[in-house]
Each structure stands twice: as C-alpha cells, then as structure tokens.
C-alpha cells in the first residue's frame, strides 16, 4: 500500500501562552505530510494546516472562540504526493492529542511593569494589561478581561540597598504600597491564577527600579 512508509505522529504537545496556542508533534516528516483536525468534545472536527511538512500548527483562531471549552486535536499522516492514500483499515494514520482547556491551562506570559509613580511615601505600580487574541464584539480582550478576578498579580519590592523582598497582591492591575521616604526601590511582578494547580504562575517581569525612566516622583 502507499502508506508503507507513513508513520503516525507522536508526542503531540500543546504550547500555549496567553491563549496563543500551537500544537506541536514529532517526527520531522520524511516522505509524508500532515493535516490537523481540532474539535470540542461535542463539536465537529475542523481541519487546519492542510498537508503540511511542518510539525506544528497554530490553533489559536479555533480555541479563542471559547477558551473555557475543552479541545481535542488529531494529526493525520499522509504519504507525500499521494494524500488520497489511506491506511490498511481504509483510514489515514492519525494520533490524538491530550485534551486541552485553554482557560485552565494556557501559560501566563511574562508580565510587564507599565509605570510606577511615587507620591510622598506611597508608590502606585501599574502592570501592563496585555492584549490577548481572544475576541468579543470584534475587539481583542486583555488578559484581565478574560480572567477577571481569577488573575492576580504579586508585586515583589525591595529597597535597592537591601535583599529582602516584600510582597503585595492585587486582583486589579494596580498596587499602592508604602515606602520609606528617600529610599529607592526596585519592583518585579508575577501573574498568578491561585485557583489553578498547574501553570499557576508566570515568569517574573523584568525588574524596574526607581531612578529609572519608567518612574515618576511627586512630593
């Protein structure tokens, strides 16, 4: 049969950050091509990445339709140049992915401190509300729009002259913290979804310190 040298895809893996979602698999194709299908548990299969020699497929457009749904994908293998050929059972070879629920599993991207402003002994630190590819009414939603109060930020802040990191938390994108007058502080933030058991935390934002250009000081 024409599928003698066709091998099924394996190691199907979801790679997803802030809902940008790519399915990856192995092996690199030799004389074969792949097509991916994706479906919700109760929905119909939709084909993507037709007859590709890539070993990844961007499924963001599909999963952002409803990030709380659970998705399943499958990767079909076809002989190169003979995509009509099927396996011995009359079906092309395919492998299923693990199930994937974007809302529960997408990784949280590295946050960014947008600004900080000192007024006397208080500092207001603002975290950038990153835009996602999730849409509602033709507009892209921010991470906060999607997760609401499920998403919190932890602020680590410390005197430039000391090593101990104090923490503050918010379920908005703003912190208001007390600082000692005349001291310079550094800041880093982490996104957290406390209700999760996996992929709970982002990596830390780049550190920003007072005396650098993102900050503003007012008496």
């Amino acid at each position: 049969s024409g599928t003698t040298n066709t091998v099924a895809a394996y190691n199907l893996t979801w790679k997803s950050t802030n809902f940008k979602t790519i399915l990856e698999w192995e092996p690199k194709p030799v004389n074969q091509v792949y097509t991916v299908q994706i479906s919700t548990k109760s929905g119909d299969w939709k084909s993507k990445c037709f007859y590709t020699t890539d070993t990844e497929c961007d499924l963001t457009d599909e999963i952002v339709k409803d990030v709380k749904q659970t998705y399943l994908a499958r990767v079909f293998s076809y002989p190169a140049g003979n995509v009509e050929s099927t396996g011995s059972a009359g079906e092309p070879l395919y492998e299923n992915s693990p199930e994937f629920t974007p809302y529960l599993e997408t990784n949280l991207g590295q946050p960014t401190i947008q600004s900080f402003e000192q007024v006397g002994t208080k500092v207001n630190v603002t975290v950038e509300d990153e835009r996602t590819l999730v849409r509602r009414n033709n507009t892209f939603l921010s991470l906060r729009d999607v997760f609401g109060k499920d998403l919190i930020y932890t602020l680590y802040y410390w005197k430039s002259s000391s090593s101990g990191k104090k923490t503050a938390k918010t379920n908005t994108n703003e912190f208001l913290i007390d600082v000692d007058k005349g001291e310079n502080y550094c800041f880093s933030v982490q996104a957290v979804i406390p209700s999760r058991t996996v992929n709970r935390k982002s990596t830390d934002s780049p550190v920003e310190c007072m005396g650098q250009e993102k900050g503003e000081f007012r008496e």
Epitope: K169, I177, V192, P194, V198, R200
Partner: antibody
Framework: EVQLVESGGGLVQPGGSLRLACAAS????????IHWVRQAPGKGLEWVGY????????YYADSVKGRFTISADTSKNTAYLQMNSLRAEDTAVYYC?????????????WGQGTLVTVSS | DIQMTQSPSSLSASVGDRVTITCRAS??????VAWYQQKPGKAPKLLIY???FLYSGVPSRFSGSRSGTDFTLTISSLQPEDFATYYC?????????FGQGTKVEIK
Amino acid sequence: EVQLVESGGGLVQPGGSLRLACAASGFTIGVYIIHWVRQAPGKGLEWVGYIDPSNGYTYYADSVKGRFTISADTSKNTAYLQMNSLRAEDTAVYYCARDDQSVSSPFDYWGQGTLVTVSS
Amino acid sequence: DIQMTQSPSSLSASVGDRVTITCRASQDVNTAVAWYQQKPGKAPKLLIYSASFLYSGVPSRFSGSRSGTDFTLTISSLQPEDFATYYCQQHYTTPPTFGQGTKVEIK
C-alpha cells in the same frame, strides 16, 4: 493529598546551628510560596520568613534577620530553614505553611511542626 | 509592621453559645485577613480567608466579617470540638502578622 512534613528539630546549644526541612507532597512547591512560622511554648504564632521557590525571593522577620536563611530545592520538593547563632528565645515549635498566593494569601496547609530547643 | 490586636485573650463559654472574637488592624489591610483554629499540640487550621470566606470543609457555624479595620470571627453555636485557640492574621503586606490569640475554654 497535600501534605507538609517538617523534620530536623532537636536540642541545640546557644550559638549553635540547625537545619530544618519541610518536605511537600501532593503539590509542587515551585508554584506556591512557603512560609516558616514558629510558636514558643505557651505563646502565640510568630511569622519567621518566606521563600518563593520560583525565583528564590525571601523575606525575614527582624528577629531572625541575618541569622536564619530559607532556601528551597524544587527537585526534592522541599524547603529548608537554616538557623545559625541560635538563642534561647528561638526555642519553639517551627511550622512550615503553604501560601496559596491569592490576594489575601491565607496559609491553607501547615505541617505538623518540629520542636527546636535551644539550651545549654 | 501592621499590628493585629486581638480580643479577648481568653473567654469561657458553654456548648451552644454564640462566640465573637475581634481583631483590629493598626492600618488598612483591605480584606486580607484570615482566621485559624489551633488545638493543643497541633498545627493551626485555616477557617476563614479574605475576611469572610469560609474555607473548604469548615462548618458553617463559623463566619467572618469586616468593618473597616475591625475583623470579627463568630461561632454561631459553640460545639465541643470548637474549644481551642483562635488567631487572626493579616497578609496585606509583608511581614504577615498574627493576633495574640484567643483561647476559648469550657465554662
């Protein structure tokens, strides 16, 4: 099942050192914050310090700063409290606790505690 | 550091009594207050978080409330297993601080 188990307590002379361990199971310490809290005999709870194992950040109570060090080994899923220059007033049951890192950050799981006695 | 002033330090009550314990924060801590129960020789157990939310598995006779910087733990009908020491804790800012504790004893 989430569990924290402390070990390493015992009798130590003033000025001595001790290392306590907090072994976690049922969750990954790398995505939580781990605190150490102590309780002197017949007294209330006193916070000692925390570590965020994801970045190594720590903070300590003034009473232990410079003497105690918290660390974590995520491959062993264990946090540690290294206690140096111990004093009689460090005598206490030492607990580790998990911080769920929500906005109010309650300590949702605690270990059973390990007794440290500093005495000559 | 934020001080959490807890009162009373001890109280005597009977089974079925309504018991109220209060904690006052020395400055604003929003709702970042938890309440714990501790029995002799045991680790503390979380009862209430975010000032008024009942932790999973905790009986509904326990409740928490907030009025400004004053926080209250109420046991609506004291049960034999509720005789213990109770602590409030703020974690609005580092370092987190505990109240001095309230020992609930049998009258």
